[in-house]
């Protein structure tokens, strides 16, 4: 209207979706009577009456605002509840007297979007793609107005870059009036991006100011060709026979190429392909010295059929050969001397040790063991250990048995056995000597003989206890080419008062056995009856 002053800018009221907007009519008393006001909403330049105030009393007009409007602040403020994005428009109040004046309010509506949902290309990105590929998507749901998206790589914002980086954003309006933003990051990636961290950030505004939400960080599968191939051996360090050894082919490409591992044949000077497991790993278990040699890996790109060869790697499986001792079966007279010599081969320097088998006592450090003035007790086992000091656990041993010529030697000379009449008695007798003796008994019964070792024999006799046997006792005699020797077993009747309560006498069996280690006196095992204290 000519001569009318230009409309002032509307007052700005900012609210979040779902909250209540307070629309305060800013007409001064001179511009109009606030007890008589009409409220309008303006949409696409069309004004619609939504509320009347008469004599300070409010009345909603039928329509979309009917249920959501009420008067506050003695009629000066119109409250709009449950604000929606569709409420973002101009509202105006118009006073009726003395002159029709209006006051405009611009309602701005805000809603924070949900946390951004980032998705990575599930198939990955090849570095040699001809065009930028879809790297990831970022979706921000239910925001208002449309949030802004910024993509980051390793903490730095990504900018559009011709033929390198392209950000494609689109939005959809939900039935609620809220916006869902989808942003697609397209890029040409390079090998170095395999470890890059990408994320997206949504920037949005609320009445309280500017805010942002970040997605989780993601890495993108990046595919790049193999440039280098190499072999790795596990375990690292010195290998020995018996170890589990893995020879693994590695490449710097993704996905890994197809591998084959071959070993050089020293005689033919040709490489022979080895059988690897499904992962392309050659497993040597147990490793043997024959596995030593030169290995190399060939990597094949199945798309291009181009192959790459690794640097060859020498594998040394350290070993100790079988140990040889000479003489292998020594026999000596008492009082004589003996020299035992130990030999073995190895891929490393060897150390030798001689040990007594029965005691594990170290007798000599070195391959030669000299024994002088041999006694009968010197008979038995001698062990040579050949070891590689630099490789723990790499050793081999050989046992040699020394036999000392001599007549039989009894485990005991005499012994007392407690018995009951008419019981079946199990008696045992042990003797050693070289040549190995045989044992005989002076009474009838069932005898059985068993070798303890080449120089030692144990004989057992089952016999019925009779009065005559009680009278005579039992003798066992051991004999060989060099003489004979006897042990005597005295049988004594036990009377029941000498038994302890837990003694087991129900079997009617008494066992008399000499321990192989006890050379002077006898010990009995199993259900041997206790000796009465009164007998001493």
């Amino acid at each position: 209207v000519p001569g009318e002053a230009e409309q002032p800018a509307p007052e700005l009221v900012e609210v979040e979706v779902g909250s209540t907007a307070l629309l305060k009519c800013g007409l001064s008393q001179s511009q109009g009577n606030l007890s008589h006001v009409d409220w309008f909403s303006v949409h696409k330049e069309k004004r619609t009456l939504i509320f009347r105030v008469r004599q300070g009393q409010g009345q909603s007009e039928p329509g979309e605002y009917e249920q959501r409007l009420s008067l506050q602040d003695r009629g000066a403020t119109l409250a709009l509840t449950q604000v929606t994005p569709q409420d973002e428009r101009i509202f105006l109040c118009q006073g009726k007297r003395p002159r029709s004046q209006e006051y405009r309010i611009q309602l701005r509506v805000y809603k924070a979007p949900e946390e951004p949902n980032i998705q990575v290309n599930p198939l990955g990105i090849p570095v040699n793609s001809k065009e930028p590929e879809e790297v990831a998507t970022c979706v921000g749901r239910n925001g208002y107005p449309i949030p802004q998206v910024i993509w980051y790589k390793n903490g730095r914002p990504l900018k559009e870059e011709k033929n390198r980086v392209h950000i494609q954003s689109s939005q959809t309006v939900e039935s609620s009036g809220l916006y869902t933003l989808q942003s697609i990051l397209k890029a040409q990636l390079v090998k170095e991006d395999k470890d890059a961290q990408f994320y997206c950030e949504l920037n949005y505004r609320l009445p309280s100011g500017n805010h942002m939400k970040e997605s989780r960080e993601v890495t993108v599968p990046v595919f790049y060709p193999t440039e280098k191939v190499w072999l790795e051996v596990e375990p690292v360090g010195m290998l020995k026979e018996g170890d589990r050894v893995e020879i693994r082919c590695l490449a710097d490409g993704n996905p890994p190429p197809h591998f084959s591992i071959s070993k050089g044949n020293p005689s033919t000077r040709e490489a022979e392909e080895e059988t690897t497991n499904d992962n392309g790993v050659l497993v040597l278990e147990p490793a043997r010295k024959e596995h030593s040699g030169r290995y190399e890996c060939q990597a094949w790109n199945l798309d291009t059929m181009i192959s790459l060869l690794s640097e060859p790697q020498e594998l040394l499986v350290n070993y100790v050969s079988d140990v040889r001792v000479s003489p292998a079966a020594p026999e000596r007279q008492e009082g004589s001397s003996l020299t035992l010599t130990c030999e073995a081969e190895s891929s490393q320097d060897l150390e030798f040790q001689w040990l007594r088998e029965e005691t594990d006592q170290v007798l000599e450090r070195g391959p030669v063991l000299q024994l002088h003035d041999l006694k009968r007790e010197a008979g038995g086992g001698y062990r040579c250990v050949a070891s590689v000091p630099s490789i723990p656990g790499l050793n081999r041993t050989q046992l040699v048995k020394l036999a000392i010529f001599g007549p039989p030697w009894m485990a005991f000379k005499e012994r007392k056995v407690w018995v009951k009449e008419n019981m079946v008695l199990n008696l045992s007798c042990e003797a050693s000597g070289h040549p190995r003796p045989t044992i005989s008994w002076n009474v009838n019964g069932t005898a059985s003989e068993g070798d303890q070792d080449p120089q030692r024999v144990l004989s057992t006799l089952n016999v019925l206890v009779t009065p005559e046997l009680l009278e005579t006792g039992v003798e066992c005699t051991a004999s060989n080419d060099l003489g004979k020797n006897t042990s005597i077993l005295f049988l004594e009747l036990v009377n029941l008062t000498t038994l302890t309560p837990d003694s087991n006498t129900t079997t009617g069996l008494s066992t008399s056995t000499a321990s192989p280690h006890t050379r002077a006196n006898s010990t009995s095992t199993e259900r041997k009856l206790p000796e009465p204290e009164s007998r001493g």
Partner: antibody, heavy 116, light 106 residues
């Protein structure tokens, strides 16, 4: 309106090569990737191969050595070839559009029977 | 490879019933999950993407929920036209599908 249509032989002999064509309309192959998916009778869906909007190709490693996927952008066609066919490859073969990572539109599928 | 385990393999429900199908991933796939409806001789239909987003044109009785490894497709009120086989699919690393759930009307 987005549509995808698979075409190819209904019957293939064992050891032969299968060639399937997916003809698309309503979008450009330079804007969306396309995947091939199959479903053997009475079994679940199985992804076979894909070609991205940028032209990169991807294969299910279970079939890798037997597959080739390619496209003709001017004809709006994606072609899948599968060599050395076997009766276990009998299935309904579908092509599907990527948006950008899930499949939003599918073809109705074509049943391929492998039999001598 | 990520395995997707769907249950049940089949179900029978009455019209108007609430039907729930579950899908479990062998590892965390965040929200990279879609649900499809397959009917014999028909074009497979995308119902849900990003675990809980309803595809345009799909009735609101279909809804999806879940994140990480456990996901659910719900049909709030089963209709005769919902008889089909339903598949979940992960697109976090490669593409793999669940074994499918056949839905029938009692």
């Amino acid at each position: 309106q987005v549509t995808l249509k698979e075409s190819g032989p209904v019957l293939v002999k064992p050891t032969e090569t299968l060639t399937l064509t997916c003809t698309v309309s309503g979008f450009s192959l330079t804007s969306n990737g396309v995947s091939w998916v199959r479903q053997p009778p009475g079994k679940a869906l199985e992804w076979i191969a894909a070609i991205s909007s940028g032209g990169s190709t991807y294969y299910n490693s279970a079939f890798k050595s037997r597959l080739t996927i390619s496209r003709n952008t001017s004809k709006s066609q994606v072609v899948l070839t599968m060599t050395n066919m076997d009766p276990v490859d009998t299935a309904t073969y579908y092509c599907a559009r990527h948006r950008p990572f899930y499949f939003d539109y599918w073809g109705q599928g074509t049943l391929v029977t492998v039999s001598s | 490879d990520i395995q997707m385990t769907q249950s049940p393999s089949s179900l029978s429900a009455s019209v108007g019933d609430r039907v729930t199908i579950t899908c479990k991933g062998s590892q965390n796939i965040y929200k990279s999950l879609a649900w499809f409806q397959l009917k014999p001789g028909k074009v497979p239909k995308l119902l849900i993407y990003d675990a809980n987003s309803l595809q345009t044109g799909i009735p609101s009785r279909f809804s999806g929920s879940g994140s990480g490894t456990d996901f659910t497709l719900t049909i709030s009120s089963l209709q005769p036209e919902d008889v089909a086989t339903y598949y979940c699919q992960q697109y976090y690393s490669g593409y793999t599908f669940g074994g499918g759930t056949k839905v029938e009307i009692k």
